[in-house]
């Protein structure tokens, strides 16, 4: 056979589908690899061929499109399972070809089992809701194209294992689930089960997503520097270790770039010759507000170092702040025998 542009196994699309449910999988060639769509290819006389390799096998084999009730079928650039079976797991290849052209790509399909509470190895998308922000909605994902608009499916929503009905602040509204006032107690996994008829059969689509309630932009503030502050003076003798923590609170802000850095005499630490180290730690609240601490450390501080300006800077999408640490050289305690004795007029 003539040479074929082989895009290999496209592992970036780890497709997971539930057992005993319909699945429609588009050939990735047209979405990610080729500059034309299926219609153009079809008009140009190109044919789309599907085949697969079963899990733990090396042998490529054709897909059986003659199963009872057309369990597996192809429609344009979509491979349909009505429904999937556990042993459909494997690597699927779609190949576009004619006598002069050939291009193909493989992708992994995993059919996964779920328990009665919708727990499964499925990777779950995360949807963030703002705390106490007013009405917010989540939508049952990835159900487009399974049934025509003339079909009116029934949709049942669950939180964890429990059907959502008569919940205080969560209201099912068809494909949408509305949160009147999102609270921390609304964190969890939400599942929509879409039931629709097709050719005298009933199919179910199960979609689960994780809801995470985060800080509201209404409450977001510029970074707050808790330390250094005006109440703490870092008083050291030359030769001692100087440790100055910079502790900054950041409100949660979607996609905000939160940064903390020190300057010494207006320069970044690596632009000066002092032997300084900086260690960082980060902690998060339940609503994903962030506290960052950067500890500036000089092992053996010199009298010159104690005259320098140490400033902690913080920046988020809400603004930038800076605070200088109060650093001074400790005045040595008087040596009694000499200084005090002289003070009393001793000779």
């Amino acid at each position: 056979s003539e040479r074929c542009d082989d895009w290999g196994l496209d592992t970036m699309r780890q497709i997971q589908v539930f057992e005993d449910e319909p699945a429609r999988i588009k050939c990735p060639l047209f979405e990610h690899f080729l500059k034309f769509n299926y219609s153009t290819a079809h008009s140009a006389g190109l044919t789309l061929i599907w085949y697969w390799t079963r899990q733990d096998r090396d042998l490529e084999e054709p897909i059986n499109f003659r199963l009872p009730e057309n369990r597996i079928s192809k429609e344009k650039d979509v491979l349909w399972f009505r429904p999937t079976l556990l042993n459909d797991t494997g690597n699927y290849t779609c190949m576009l070809r004619n006598t002069t052209y050939c291009s193909k790509v493989a992708f992994p399909l995993e059919v996964v089992q779920k328990d009665s509470c919708f727990n499964s190895p499925m990777k779950l998308p995360v949807h963030k809701l703002y705390i106490e922000y007013g009405i917010q909605r989540i939508t049952c994902p990835n159900v487009d194209g399974y049934f025509p608009s003339s079909v009116k499916p029934t949709i049942t929503w669950y939180m964890g294992c429990y059907k959502i009905q008569n919940f205080n602040n969560v209201i099912p509204e068809g494909m949408n689930l509305s949160f009147l006032i999102a609270l921390i107690s609304n964190n969890g996994n939400y599942t929509c089960v879409v039931t629709y008829p097709e050719n005298g059969r009933t199919f179910h689509l199960t979609r689960t997503l994780t809801v995470k309630v985060v800080g509201s932009p209404k409450n977001a503030v510029p970074p707050v520097i808790h330390s250094p502050n005006d109440h703490v003076v870092y008083e050291k003798e030359p030769g001692e270790e100087l440790l100055i923590p910079c502790t900054v609170y950041f409100s949660f802000l979607m996609d905000s770039r939160n940064e903390v850095w020190w300057t010494i005499d207006g320069k970044k630490p690596d632009d000066i010759t002092i032997d300084v180290t900086i260690n960082e730690s980060i902690s998060h609240s339940r609503t994903e507000d962030e506290t960052r601490t950067q500890i500036l450390s000089i092992k053996k501080v010199t009298s010159e170092d104690l005259k320098r300006s140490y400033v902690c800077h913080a920046r988020s999408a809400k603004g930038e702040v800076a605070k200088a640490a109060k650093v001074k050289q400790k005045v040595p305690a008087p040596r009694y025998t000499v200084e005090l004795a002289c003070g009393f007029g001793a000779t």
Epitope: D255, S256, R257, E259, W261, K268, P269, D270, V276, T277, I278, E280, Q294, R315, A317, G319, E320
Partner: antibody, heavy 117, light 107 residues
Framework: QVQLQESGPGLVKPSETLSLTCAVS?????????WAWIRQPPGKGLEWIGN???????YYNPSLESRVSISLDTSKHQVSLKLKSVTYADTAVYFC??????????WGQGTMVTVSS | EIVMTQSPATLSVSPGERATLSCRAS??????LAWYQQKPGQAPRLLIY???TRATGIPARFSGSGSGTEFTLTISSLQSEDFAVYYC?????????FGGGTKLEIK
């Protein structure tokens, strides 16, 4: 003075993994900042790929996130880029750069990577 | 993501004249913006950060202004070495994004 030098194969086959290394010289251990990868397809503009912080925390361009991985080896003073399942659209000059919170202040000279079968 | 839009795509100016390049952000980025200059076959060079602060070694003829969503790079008196492509970049939010560039050419 910090200097950056990208290296790696100039030719990668479609569907394979692109692997590049950025050697950092004049590196300071006290620098809590980012190393970045940026690319530029022929005749086009700049596209940010991702940043890695001193601690190993990473941020990626969402359009590449499922395929990209950036790592930092502080002992070797190296920043690495891996881009899986490459296509012809990944043909570009790849730059590494330093990001000290105020833009990319130091850049490598860039390395051209062509995706071709 | 924040979309950065630069205008014009190409600007023709005579040496010695003033050049004004614009950059617009799709949402507010405070003053967290950088400008870069890139010459053919070279890596970009940081010119301005924080919307208006010149990077080390950048001549005083380069100045940046603006805050929020509208930003300007001004080159007061164009020298022959200034003809290049200029990019703006926001670093206020992830993902970091660049403008499409303005090519500054000799009139």
């Amino acid at each position: 003075q910090v200097q950056l030098q990208e290296s790696g194969p100039g030719l990668v086959k479609p569907s394979e993994t692109l692997s590049l290394t950025c050697a950092v010289s004049g590196y300071s251990a006290s620098g809590l900042y980012y190393w970045a990868w940026i690319r530029q397809p022929p005749g086009k503009g700049l596209e940010w790929i991702g940043n890695i912080y001193h601690s190993g925390r990473t941020y990626y361009n969402p359009s590449l996130e499922s395929r990209v991985s950036i790592s930092l080896d502080t002992s070797k003073h190296q920043v690495s880029l891996k881009l899986k399942s490459v296509t012809y659209a990944d043909t570009a000059v790849y730059f590494c750069a330093r990001d000290r919170f105020d833009g990319f202040d130091i850049w490598g000279q860039g390395t051209m990577v062509t995706v071709s079968s | 993501e924040i979309v950065m839009t630069q205008s014009p795509a190409t600007l023709s100016v005579s040496p010695g004249e003033r050049a004004t390049l614009s950059c617009r952000a799709s949402q507010t980025i405070n003053n967290i913006l950088a400008w870069y200059q890139q010459k053919p076959g070279q890596a970009p060079r940081l010119l301005i950060y924080g919307a208006s602060t010149r990077a080390t070694g950048i001549p005083a003829r380069f100045s940046g202004s603006g805050s929020g969503t509208e930003f300007t790079l001004t080159i007061s008196s164009l020298q022959s070495e200034d003809f290049a492509v200029y990019y703006c970049q926001q670093y206020n939010n992830w993902p970091l994004t660049f403008g499409g560039g303005t090519k500054l050419e000799i009139k």
